[in-house]
Interface confidence: medium
């Protein structure tokens, strides 16, 4: 099965890397430092 991170979700993660967890069939983001949220779009103001 094609990895959705390379197609439909290739621009999903704003400040992070897209990751497809196949065994749960979910797309998630691994955020860059100081960022958080579903799409890594929120910045930690304390950082």
């Amino acid at each position: 099965k094609k990895n959705p991170c390379t197609a439909k979700f290739q621009n999903f993660c704003i400040h992070g890397e897209c990751r497809y967890i196949e065994n749960l069939e979910v797309v998630t983001c691994n955020c860059h430092q100081d960022y958080f949220g579903e799409r890594c779009g929120e910045k930690d103001l304390l950082a």
């Epitope: 749960l24 979910v26 983001c29 960022y35």
Partner: antibody, heavy 124, light 112 residues
């Protein structure tokens, strides 16, 4: 508000079948893996099954494998548990639980919301 | 299967006092890539379980800061800094690093 409402429990004879349902609302059901967990009377919690978002992957402990089948209908926002060849030891309250992604920088999945449960009694 | 062992089985506490629950797993819960899938649930009398702590030490939404989790590898602890009346119930640790997911036997917190 996340809501999970189980139904379908009841009294059934050993060897019988039952189908449990869980109606979900307040979130995008199709985006979440889902689980069933049970609790026998005066006992602890036991994981029963988990299903992936699209239903392609399902997981069971040995205690129910081959007898129970988890499924989902994303169009109806519903989760199901088909229970066959029921035994007295399957008597329990069955909870539907969402496998929620908790975002803290990297993903993390945990059973973040639970329904109130439906009671299954297996007895002759 | 991973066996989760909790102690004590019962924990009578005085209101305002601290409380500590131990959870030990039969093998390491560290997932090389994704951290440690160790969670704590609270089940008040007559209610369904609620997620309290996830990823060993992270409090879930709305959980008071008197609850804290710690530990690593195979040994984990849930602490309540000052027990309140609403904390009465059974607490379960749970691992979801490895299938089958497993729960501890539970620790019943009651007021003396």
């Amino acid at each position: 508000e996340v809501q999970l409402v189980e139904s379908g429990g009841g009294l059934v004879k050993p060897g019988g079948s039952l189908r449990l349902s869980c109606a979900a609302s307040g979130f995008t059901f199709s985006s979440y893996p889902m689980s069933w967990v049970r609790q026998a009377p005066e006992k602890g919690l036991e994981w029963v099954s988990t299903i992936s978002t699209g239903g392609r992957y399902t997981y069971y402990p040995d205690s129910v494998k081959g007898r129970f089948t988890i499924s989902r209908d994303n169009a109806k926002n519903s989760l199901y548990l088909q229970m066959n060849s029921l035994r007295a030891e399957d008597t329990a309250v069955y909870y539907c639980a969402r496998q929620g992604p908790i975002y803290y920088g990297n993903y993390y999945y945990a059973m973040d919301y639970w329904g109130q449960g439906t009671t299954v009694t297996v007895s002759s | 299967d991973i066996v989760m062992t909790q102690s004590p089985l019962s924990l009578p506490v005085t209101l305002g006092d601290p409380a500590s629950i131990s959870c030990r797993s039969s093998q390491s819960l560290v997932d090389g890539e994704d951290g440690t899938y160790l969670n704590w649930f609270q089940q008040r009398p007559g209610q369904s379980p609620k997620l309290l702590i996830y990823k060993v030490s992270e409090r879930f939404d709305g959980v008071p800061d008197r609850f804290s989790g710690s530990g690593s590898g195979t040994d984990f602890t849930l602490k309540i800094s000052r027990v309140e009346a609403e904390d009465v119930g059974v607490y379960y640790c749970s691992q979801s690093t490895h299938v089958p997911y497993t729960f501890g036997g539970g620790t019943k917190v009651e007021i003396k």
